[in-house]
């Protein structure tokens, strides 16, 4: 590497890279400055003068250290669905993700740009697996024994209450009723909730999301209103 | 949502090789600086490669240059680190990271990897 | 190569205490230096950049300052959380290098 008395631009010696915060310059052959986030380079540098910088204009920015000519723009303004979990700054893109009870269908690398509703469960039907950021919620019809009477994104399949006399026995969409005796064992009587997904602010706090069981094919999937899957509503 | 995961590393015999890699998701793998840095057992970090967000720039410290090499496939979103001749004092926890801004500040750091000495 | 030497090594201190520990390079680095977090087990992670930038999510009890050859980190209200490493590092120039380490515990 070049003694640290060198000032930019300078010529690297042979088999050396230029020093952080630096890049070389095909056309000069010379280590030249970079720009910092938030500027970009207004004039390339010659072998007598080093970059100059320039800040990036509104609604666009620059995330790194870099040479670029101009500051990239910010992505378009969050829809109807989404939060804006991330502002657009010199120094950074918009970030949108999605809404509590929706989830992203399609991801990019940063954010999300398709958000979908979470599936919910209709009667008879409870939550196997709660939705994530990431992936929709999957139902199940209730087990003997079990029953849900509600359409729900957090509900799950709860336990019949057990009477000593039964008036009307239970369903997987309706609880045991009882005759006026007491019953010997009764669940609670609010419905078991599973959490819904958060959406965070940082990137670096995020609980990892359980990876979808269904194939990433978002993609290719019509943009309008699909049919409900089995227990769901579209609700 | 940004995760990096480093492969397994494990034992080598002293003069041995092995390659390790890093899968990247949640962020633009491609315009990342990247870096690989160690930590022997119960001893602190040490610094040990970087590559530029295009593969072109790649740096050593001296411990391990002429040894180890590190690279990128930015088509399959990951990291490598070649390391021949490997020698007892290269026994260490080995970490993946991403640098926020192309200016060796580590802001994302893959779970580790031991690679270990089986002599 | 630029040595980095953090002081002290280890420390103990109350939950509620203020916390410094110090971090001295052999030349001058700007502003060029960041401090970082570990946990037993655990990878390291980034709290302050560039000397005094709080990194996103992380708490504000966190702080750093100084620049040139020396930098303070500090925590305002130690919590039972913060029992972990910190390290400090130095991006001014190449080889990247961190200081030794500071351990703190609580009392």
């Known amino acids: 590497l070049p003694a640290q008395v060198a000032f930019t631009p300078y010529a690297p010696e042979p088999g050396s890279t230029c020093r952080l915060r630096e890049y070389y310059d095909q056309t000069a052959q010379m280590c030249c400055s970079k720009c910092s986030p938030g500027q970009h380079a207004k004039v390339f540098c010659t072998k007598t003068s080093d970059t100059v910088c320039d800040s990036c204009e509104d609604s666009t920015y620059t995330q790194l250290w870099n040479w670029v000519p101009e500051c990239l723009s910010c992505g378009s303004r969050c829809s109807s669905d989404q939060v804006e979990t991330q502002a657009c700054t010199r120094e950074q893109n918009r970030i949108c993700t999605c809404r509590p009870g929706w989830y992203c269908a399609l991801s990019k690398q940063e954010g999300c740009r398709l958000c979908a509703p979470l599936r919910k469960c209709r009667p008879g039907f409870g939550v196997a697996r709660p939705g994530t950021e990431t992936s929709d919620v999957v139902c199940k019809p209730c087990a003997p024994g079990t029953f849900s009477n509600t359409t729900s994104s957090t509900d799950i399949c709860r336990p019949h209450q057990i009477c000593n006399v039964v008036a009307i026995p239970g369903n997987a969409s309706m609880d045991a009723v009882c005759t006026s005796t007491s019953p010997t064992r009764s669940m609670a009587p609010g419905a078991v909730h599973l959490p819904q997904p958060v959406s965070t602010r940082s990137q670096h706090t995020q609980p990892t999301p359980e990876p979808s069981t269904a194939p990433s094919t978002s993609f290719l999937l019509p943009m309008g209103p699909s049919p409900p899957a089995e227990g769901s509503t579209g609700d | 949502q940004v995760q990096l995961l480093e492969s397994v590393g494990g034992l080598v015999q002293p003069g041995g090789s092995l390659r390790l890699s890093c899968a990247v998701s949640g962020f633009t793998f491609s315009t990342y600086a990247m870096s690989w840095i160690r930590q022997a057992p119960g001893k602190g970090l040490e610094w040990v490669s970087i590559i530029s967000d295009g593969g072109d720039v790649t740096v050593y410290a001296d411990s391990v240059k002429g040894r180890f090499t590190i690279s990128r496939d930015n088509s399959k979103n990951t990291l490598y680190l070649q390391m021949n001749s490997l020698r007892a004092e290269d026994t260490a926890v080995y970490y993946c990271a991403r640098d926020r801004t192309s200016a060796a500040a580590f802001d994302s750091w893959g779970q580790g990897t031991l690679v270990s000495d089986s002599s | 190569d630029i040595q980095m030497t953090q002081s002290p090594s280890s420390l103990s201190a109350s939950v509620g205490d203020r916390v410094t520990i110090t971090c001295q390079a052999s030349?001058?680095?700007?502003?060029?230096l960041n401090w970082y977090q570990q946990k037993p087990g655990k990878a390291p992670k980034l709290l302050i950049y560039d000397a005094s930038t709080l990194q996103t999510g992380v708490p504000s009890r966190f702080s750093g300052s100084g620049s040139g050859t020396d930098f303070n980190f500090t925590i305002s209200s130690l919590q039972p959380e913060d029992i972990a490493t910190y390290y400090c590092q130095q991006s001014d120039s190449y080889p990247i290098t961190f200081g030794q380490g500071t351990k703190v515990e609580i009392k």
């Open positions: 030349q001058d680095i700007t502003n060029f």
